[in-house]
Amino acid sequence: HSFGPGPGLGTPRSPCNARGPCRLFFRVCLKPGVSQEATESLCALGAALSTSVPVYTEHPGESAAALPLPDGLVRVPFRDAWPGTFSLVIETWREQLGEHAGGPAWNLLARVVGRRRLAAGGPWARDVQRTGTWELHFSYRARCEPPAVGAACARLCRSRSAPSRCGPGLRPCTPFPDECEAPSVCRPGCSPEHGYCEEPDECRCLEGWTGPLCTVPVSTSSCLNSRVPGPASTGCLLPGPGPCDGNPCANGGSCSETSGSFECACPRGFYGLRCEVSGVTCADGPCFNGGLCVGGEDPDSAYVCHCPPGFQGSNCEKRVDRCSLQPCQNGGLCLDLGHALRCRCRAGFAGPRCEHDLDDCAGRACANGGTCVEGGGSRRCSCALGFGGRDCRERADPCASRPCAHGGRCYAHFSGLVCACAPGYMGVRCEFAVRPDGADAVPAAPRGLRQADPQRFLHHHHHHHH
């Protein structure tokens, strides 16, 4: 169990800042598994703070190893039955100590949130959570307080009156050999799977179930607007009329009723009617990883951290996987170096984001007088006579492509090629058929196409000459 710098995240740092010794404490918050994991939502299942906290001192130039967690357990009492699925929020807070602290200074070092599934009475579950440059190793479990037992702490047990057997009609409580199931005190018909009771003749429902006997899934309930079915009737009631019902105190504050109203006892670092205001200001240096603190210049104004690219969270404590945004174009490989992103480009591409196509005409010229032609996302060189290859760098045999049509003979020449045409043809490439009577030449049809009617063709051609 430790809190310290994660692997590969640079030189470990002491959690204390420049103002001398500090100590860490932990706030554990439980939220229903179905609730939003947003910071604002209440710790509806319960919250608690660590108590015994060792003091850490800053030793300049010395690396901070993983810090031991405070001794002892953080106990979070939960209301009603244990839901099985829940959100676990663990915040690591720093308290600045000493004469240079300038009064109590609290700020959030790290906050980890995770959805968890856990039955009550099971073994310790181990976990590792990373956030920003910190890593938290911890264990957690859920236990029922006697006389409750079971995965949801919904069954009541009591000690056996005799070592060998339970009373008439009562079964032993598993997995507790020395205890018996308590006599059924719940309302008759209360669902043994989805209901439980703490007082005689009541039937309280586990999460997801409703109705007088907890037999109706929540989605099919006819009660609207947060109302729940009333006991032994079809009417609907507003849940919990007590001022502390639903715990109006935010951030782990504990609620107490005072003459029809409520009062919140706020944990360290928070204040306000509902503990909704953080006592941290910019003076406490709450922004991590190079974040800039905006606002919070006096105790009544909240601060906001503007995070450098690559970090997020209310205190810039969370590292963003910037490569997940796929910033590298054209199939480039993304590397997040922490201080910057790098793209390793595929062959033929360049630029900070591989955005430059070296195969386009802007990237490279064609040699030996060739001209660049773009098309279909690539480029090719149209080479001058006597040259060939990808960049027109190779000397070419101009006659290799058989450029002379209709049986003309090709002769290589210093300036290119010369075609000696077969009888009846003329033109630079012997492309024109010559009429015997000396009329206009007719371009020969490309191979594979039907020859056009020469009379009609010539008629139009002559028309243009008038």
């Epitope: 240096g285 990883n289 190079g290 603190c293 503007h306 690559g310 201080h339 630029g351 900070p352």
Partner: antibody
Framework: QVQLQESGPGLVKPSETLSLTCTVS????????WSWIRQPPGKGLEWIGY???????NYNPSLKSRVTMSVDTSKNQFSLKLSSVTAADTAVYFC????????????WGQGTMVTFSS | EIVLTQSPGTLSLSPGERATLSCRAS???????LAWYQQKPGQAPRLLIY???SRATGIPDRFSGSGSGTEFTLTISRLEPEDFAVYYC?????????FGQGTRLEIK
């Protein structure tokens, strides 16, 4: 290498609005915060504000009521508008890039001198 | 806002000597959030040091930064002719971002 180039008028009449543009080369404007800083003749540096491509801005409170910044990602440019200018706004105006490990200025433009006079 | 006060206003030294420039903050700054710049006439400032003690890319190792809390120092171990310029400190932990008024380092 990354380059920043300021552009805009060198002379602006008092009470008018100054408009400057900074063109960014060889890096995507979406990857960093971008800032404006000014320096009156013979004096020190004054931070004006910064902007991120997402639209996040932060302005110096002393200038906030007169400053507007914007980003054009398609042109890889960001701009500054300073309204109701006076002779006291005469300065060299620099655009700069904020580093990715904190809000220090790691790349600067060469600056453009703007004088406010009728 | 955090006010940064630099001292001395002007420092006259010879090449080869050691220069020590001071920057004092009106409130505590996390040591991660202080930078130093060098500016020569007619040029833009150049980042030398960030995070109070980390050298920026391409900065010679004769430049070093130190300090924490409210007291920060820039040291140039052996002055070269090209080091004579104006030096500014800047804090970037708390908005508004602020600069010191500068220290002019001149040839004696």
């Amino acid at each position: 290498q990354v380059q920043l180039q300021e552009s805009g008028p060198g002379l602006v009449k008092p009470s008018e609005t100054l408009s400057l543009t900074c063109t960014v080369s060889n890096v995507s404007i979406s990857s960093y915060y971008w800032s404006w800083i000014r320096q009156p003749p013979g004096k020190g540096l004054e931070w004006i504000g910064y902007i991120y491509y997402s639209g996040t801005t932060n302005y110096n409170p002393s200038l906030k009521s007169r400053v507007t910044m914007s980003v054009d990602t398609s042109k890889n440019q960001f701009s500054l508008k300073l309204s109701s200018v006076t002779a006291a706004d005469t300065a060299v105006y620099f655009c700069a890039r904020l580093s990715n490990w904190g809000f220090a200025f790691d790349i600067w433009g060469q600056g453009t001198m703007v004088t406010f006079s009728s | 806002e955090i006010v940064l006060t630099q001292s001395p206003g002007t420092l006259s030294l010879s090449p080869g000597e050691r220069a020590t420039l001071s920057c004092r903050a009106s409130q505590t700054i996390s040591s991660s959030y202080l930078a130093w710049y060098q500016q020569k006439p007619g040029q833009a400032p150049r980042l030398l040091i960030y995070g109070a003690s980390s050298r920026a890319t391409g900065i010679p190792d004769r430049f070093s930064g130190s300090g924490s809390g409210t007291e920060f120092t820039l040291t140039i171990s052996r002055l070269e002719p090209e080091d004579f310029a104006v030096y500014y400190c800047q804090q970037y932990g708390w908005s508004p971002i602020t600069f010191g008024q500068g220290t002019r380092l001149e040839i004696k």
